[in-house]
Interface confidence: low
């Protein structure tokens, strides 16, 4: 192959000028013509100067993978995927996310110590003895209340998840 310059690509034993971002090669340069470049069609892109005969397919952000589109695809840049609300990234691919997972739900008896982010899952914490959380929120675990005076006996011991009344 010939040693082509940065703005050229090899075609047989010669070098042809590359097409710009957003364009692909329709026809290589010839004796009387420069490279014939054609715009990328919707749903395809090329981000750099290139000698490609076809534009690249834009990636799809699959909701089934917990993904949503954070940047639409243009003819010069691929789409970027982010996590849908309530999801965090489990597979990072360069500057975008390839797969997300729904935040963990704190179980009864646990409180949310730290809310989930785009890159981290929800962090749950067990409620200390004598406290409870029924809905697994960021609220502090609640202290169990004493039985009302008209109840003669406790129905059972309180747990961190619920209380007997």
């Amino acid at each position: 192959l010939p040693s082509c310059k940065e703005d050229e690509y090899p075609v047989g034993s010669e070098c042809c000028p590359k097409c710009g971002p957003g364009f692909h090669v329709r026809q290589a340069c010839g004796e009387q013509t420069g490279t014939v470049c054609e715009p990328c069609s919707p749903g395809t892109y090329i981000a750099h100067f290139n000698g490609l005969s076809k534009c690249l397919q834009c990636q799809m952000c699959d909701p089934a993978m917990g993904l949503r589109t954070s940047r639409n695809c243009s003819t010069t840049a691929n789409a970027l995927c982010g996590c849908s609300p309530g999801h965090f990234c489990i597979i990072q691919d360069g500057d975008h996310c390839a797969a997300c997972r729904a935040y963990a739900t704190s179980s009864p008896g646990q409180r949310v110590q730290k809310g989930g982010t785009e890159s981290q899952d929800t962090l749950c914490q067990n409620c200390p003895p004598g406290t409870f959380s029924s809905n697994g929120t960021l609220e502090e675990c609640q202290h169990g209340t004493k039985c009302s005076k008209w109840l003669v006996t406790e129905a059972g011991p309180g747990t961190s998840s619920f209380r007997w009344v």
Epitope: P2, K5, S13, E14, E31, Q32
Partner: antibody, heavy 119, light 108 residues
Framework: QVQLKQSGPGLVQPSQSLSITCTVS????????VHWVRQSPGKGLEWLGV???????DYNPAFISRLSISKDNSKSQVFFKMNTLQASDTAIYYC?????????????WGQGTSFTVSS | EIVLTQSPALMTASPGEKVTITCSVS???????LHWYQQKSEASPKPWIY???NLASGVPVRFSGSGSGTSYSLTISSMEAEDAATYYC?????????FGSGTKLEIK
């Protein structure tokens, strides 16, 4: 190997025409274009025209009215004809192959054909 | 048309001397379209440097080419007797193709 062989020298009268045949070997005229360049005595090089692999031609605007370049691919021959000659057309005429290199420089040249225009 | 002006028109160099020939172009051209040819007396021109800086096959590595825009040069790092010849620059950035008037390089 690649060669371009030109027909022999000549002496022509003013207002007459000159004809040169360039016979190529080692490559096909269906793939490569052929340029014509001349060099007047004691002077530099002057591009006259080119015939492309597909048969199209481009001429130097200064000569377009009296220049004709054609070819026979099957015989690997390129034909050059210039009409209405003047003394200033006395020169060595070269055929040269258009190369597939950076910028498409002329990579192989014929040996040249000397033409003198004189009465 | 694009005019190529070479300088000097004639120069003499001693063996081992560094030599630089310049080619000034009347309007900006792409560096890929500027070439140099060597011609010795009674011989056809030979391609010498393609696309500003690419040596043709068989050209000694003491030769180099550089430039961009409207200013180009051919340099011999150490002159040798066999380098004595006339050197022409040529452009194919636009029609018609044009050549410089040549630089005749002689050896002392």
């Amino acid at each position: 190997q690649v060669q371009l062989k030109q027909s022999g020298p000549g002496l022509v009268q003013p207002s007459q025409s000159l004809s040169i045949t360039c016979t190529v070997s080692g490559f096909s005229l269906t793939t490569y274009g052929v340029h014509w360049v001349r060099q007047s005595p004691g002077k530099g090089l002057e591009w006259l025209g080119v015939i492309w692999s597909g048969g199209n031609t481009d001429y130097n605007p200064a000569f377009i009215s009296r220049l004709s370049i054609s070819k026979d691919n099957s015989k690997s021959q390129v034909f050059f004809k210039m009409n209405t000659l003047q003394a200033s057309d006395t020169a060595i005429y070269y055929c040269a192959r258009r190369g597939y290199n950076k910028g498409y420089a002329m990579d192989y040249w014929g040996q040249g054909t000397s033409f003198t225009v004189s009465s | 048309e694009i005019v190529l002006t070479q300088s000097p028109a004639l120069m003499t160099a001693s063996p081992g001397e560094k030599v630089t020939i310049t080619c000034s172009v009347s309007s900006t051209i792409s560096s890929r379209n500027l070439h140099w040819y060597q011609q010795k007396s009674e011989a056809s021109p030979k391609p010498w440097i393609y696309g500003t800086s690419n040596l043709a096959s068989g050209v000694p590595v003491r030769f180099s080419g550089s430039g961009s825009g409207t200013s180009y040069s051919l340099t011999i790092s150490s002159m040798e007797a066999e380098d004595a010849a006339t050197y022409y620059c040529q452009q194919w950035n636009s029609y018609p193709l044009t050549f410089g008037s040549g630089t005749k390089l002689e050896i002392k």
